[in-house]
């Protein structure tokens, strides 16, 4: 059998194979040793018994999307059946005091590979033997502690494969310089040691993406905005836009990145090298926000100029194919290519409560039967739209431990002047958070107040 017969995935074009499309990977035209590494199709009954105590699940993730030319990293994590874990020696053991369907196990080991490898014969002193090899026959690399690595991972994509010896978690990075743009499929098959052979325990596949557009994400934040995820913001308050470029392999670390903003409100273009920007919309309405990110990234070099035309016509070699690699003639050249990323959003701007202030606090004198309580009136003003509810949160002087929260609807006139009456149980210093809200906004003000003992002569004080 060949690798591509075993791993149901794409195979490479001849061009890709000749140019070693994925550095350090091998062509799936290579032979697969089925005696050492048996191949089971989906639904084969042998999968049921491939692992003691249940099925192993492999979870494949990647830091996709990857900008073409950058590295993409794939991680595989094995999830063992309940109560099983890998120990420091790479053996699979039962967790102490963990009860599964079979109850508590007397044997501490699920798989004691250390004992197996000590019993193993046929080695020549270097740890090399006919069975310490990958499916294509290449010997295992002998880093320190390699005997504690009991899983063999075979990664397969775009007609190439990569073999790795590892523990219950491995990572593999691939350079995407020559990978076709668009969604691709990565497939991983995992084997475990089994005497002098190997047994498949899990197969997993995942889509990853290679793109020529810079992956851009924008977060938007505005003070007093009630819901930052609904793309509705308030007039006359700055919105902070923060651009995150998804570049986990730091491919663009040495690139100058330019951000070109159009806020859609006829304020023109704003160009910056800073990933954050503030913008205030002064009109209500719907606006189209556009961001273009530009970075000079390492890229393929342009083809050399064509040689002078011969007088006799030469036969055409036919289509060159659609492989982006064909631009790259001289691998050692350092060429730059402008890459662009785009972000678009439709932003709705509405009236909102812009500001709230406590302008006066008054101790309301209460009749004698309630000596422990103090009633306090807060006179509050606001700017912007008219609030529909008021909330007060009364907490300790650090403003961390809430003692009391009261919300109530309010009916406020155009002047936005209202009185909020609240009860304080006992004297002391309190933190008061007062919020005025409507459908789209929530404006907050805070104050520390000192409530005196109930001596009519002692005045109410604002602690700050």
């Amino acid at each position: 059998k060949r690798f591509h017969d075993v791993l149901g995935n794409e195979r490479p074009s001849a061009y890709m194979r000749e140019h070693n499309q994925l550095n350090g990977w091998s062509s799936d035209e290579n032979d697969w040793n089925e005696k050492l590494y048996p191949v089971w199709k989906r639904g084969d009954m042998r999968w049921k018994n491939s692992w003691k105590g249940g099925r192993v699940q492999a979870v494949l993730t990647s830091d996709s999307p990857a900008l073409v030319g950058s590295n993409i990293t794939f991680a595989v994590n094995l999830i063992f059946p309940r109560c099983q874990k890998e120990d420091a020696n790479g053996n699979i053991v039962y967790e102490k005091n963990c009860r599964n369907e079979a109850g508590l196990s007397a044997d501490p080991y699920v798989y004691n590979w250390t004992a197996w490898s000590e019993d193993s014969d046929g080695e020549n002193g270097t740890g090399q033997s006919h069975h310490n090899v990958f499916p294509d026959g290449k010997p295992f690399p002998h880093h320190p502690g390699w005997r504690r690595w009991n899983f063999i991972y075979v990664f397969h994509t775009l007609g190439q494969y990569f073999q790795k010896l590892g523990r219950c978690s491995v990572r593999v990075s691939v350079n995407t310089a020559n990978v076709t743009l668009g969604p691709q499929l990565m497939e991983v098959t995992v084997y475990r040691r089994h005497g002098r052979a190997y047994v498949p325990i899990a197969q997993v596949k995942d889509v990853y993406v290679v793109t020529d557009q810079i992956p851009v994400f924008v977060t938007m934040f505005q003070k007093n905005d009630r819901n930052s995820s609904d793309e509705t913001f308030l007039k006359d308050l700055p919105i902070m836009f923060d651009v995150l470029i998804h570049d986990p392999s730091h491919f663009l670390n040495y690139s100058t990145i330019n951000y070109k903003w159009s806020f859609g409100d006829n304020t023109g273009l704003f160009v910056s090298t800073n990933h954050t920007v503030n913008h205030t919309y002064v009109l209500n309405g719907t606006f189209s926000l556009n961001l273009t990110v530009k970075a000079a990234a390492p890229g393929p070099c342009p083809p050399p100029p064509p040689p002078p035309r011969p007088s006799k016509p030469t036969p055409s070699l036919g289509p060159a194919g659609d492989n982006p690699l064909e631009l790259s003639r001289i691998p050692d050249e350092n060429c730059q290519i402008n890459r662009y990323g785009h972000f678009q959003a439709t932003i709705t701007i509405v009236e909102g409560i812009l500001e709230v202030n406590i302008i006066q606090m008054t101790d309301v004198l209460m009749p004698v039967p309630w000596p422990e309580s103090s009633l306090i009136d807060f006179v509050v003003t606001c700017q912007g739209s008219i609030p529909t509810e008021v909330c007060t949160i009364i907490s300790d002087p650090t403003c961390e431990i809430t003692q009391n929260t009261v919300c109530s609807p309010v009916d406020v006139d155009e002047m936005c002047l209202l009185t909020v009456r609240r009860t304080f149980n006992g004297s002391g210093t309190y933190c008061v958070n007062l919020t005025l809200g409507d459908d789209t906004s929530l404006a907050l003000t805070s104050t520390l107040i000192s409530v005196p003992d109930r001596d009519p002569a002692s005045p109410l004080r604002m602690a700050n």
Epitope: R11, V207, G321
Partner: antibody, heavy 115, light 107 residues
Amino acid sequence: QVQLVQSGAEVKKPGASVKVSCKASGYTFTTYWMNWVRQAPGQGLEWIGAINPSNDYTEYNQKFKDRATMTADTSTSTVYMELSSLRSEDTAVYYCGRSYSPDYWGQGTTVTVSS
Amino acid sequence: DIQMTQSPSSLSASVGDRVTITCKASQNVDNHVAWFQQKPGKAPKALIYSASYRYSGVPDRFSGSGSGTDFTLTISSLQPEDFATYFCQQYKSYPFTFGGGTKLEIK
């Protein structure tokens, strides 16, 4: 440039089978999956399945699992989709599409099932 | 199977308009969504992959966004050649499924 050229229109009787072909050029055939998608008159797109031409590995929509068969001939860079036990509701345009999510499509083959 | 619910099913607009088409998946598909344009009697044409990335040659007035279950295709300023039917597709899990389509007509 990438091209997918499909076979011509077919008229079939209910119960019969039809075999539609899709010949690929402009790229190396065995590199990409090939999808089959159909579109009934005035309707949306329906995914039938996909084949990996390098090893005839297939994925089918369960709806078509028992009636559709996809094959590939690497010597001619052609994929085939055969649909058996045809009924009138199989009347549709059948498309082949290259890659995991199709980036290039064939021109379509009209299959009419009528008694 | 994952259902892809596209809305609206039809839409009238004028040249120069900004148009938004939405697609809702019945379960999480991450960003494994593509958008296609189809004109009468023609095969679909791929516009967007992975929810937001344009295929080369696709004009930048087309943009895609979304993740998880909610996806949007936006045409920022309609051109005469954009009047067509648009489909979304999920390729997160088999069987791959398409939205019902949005027919974009001249007002």
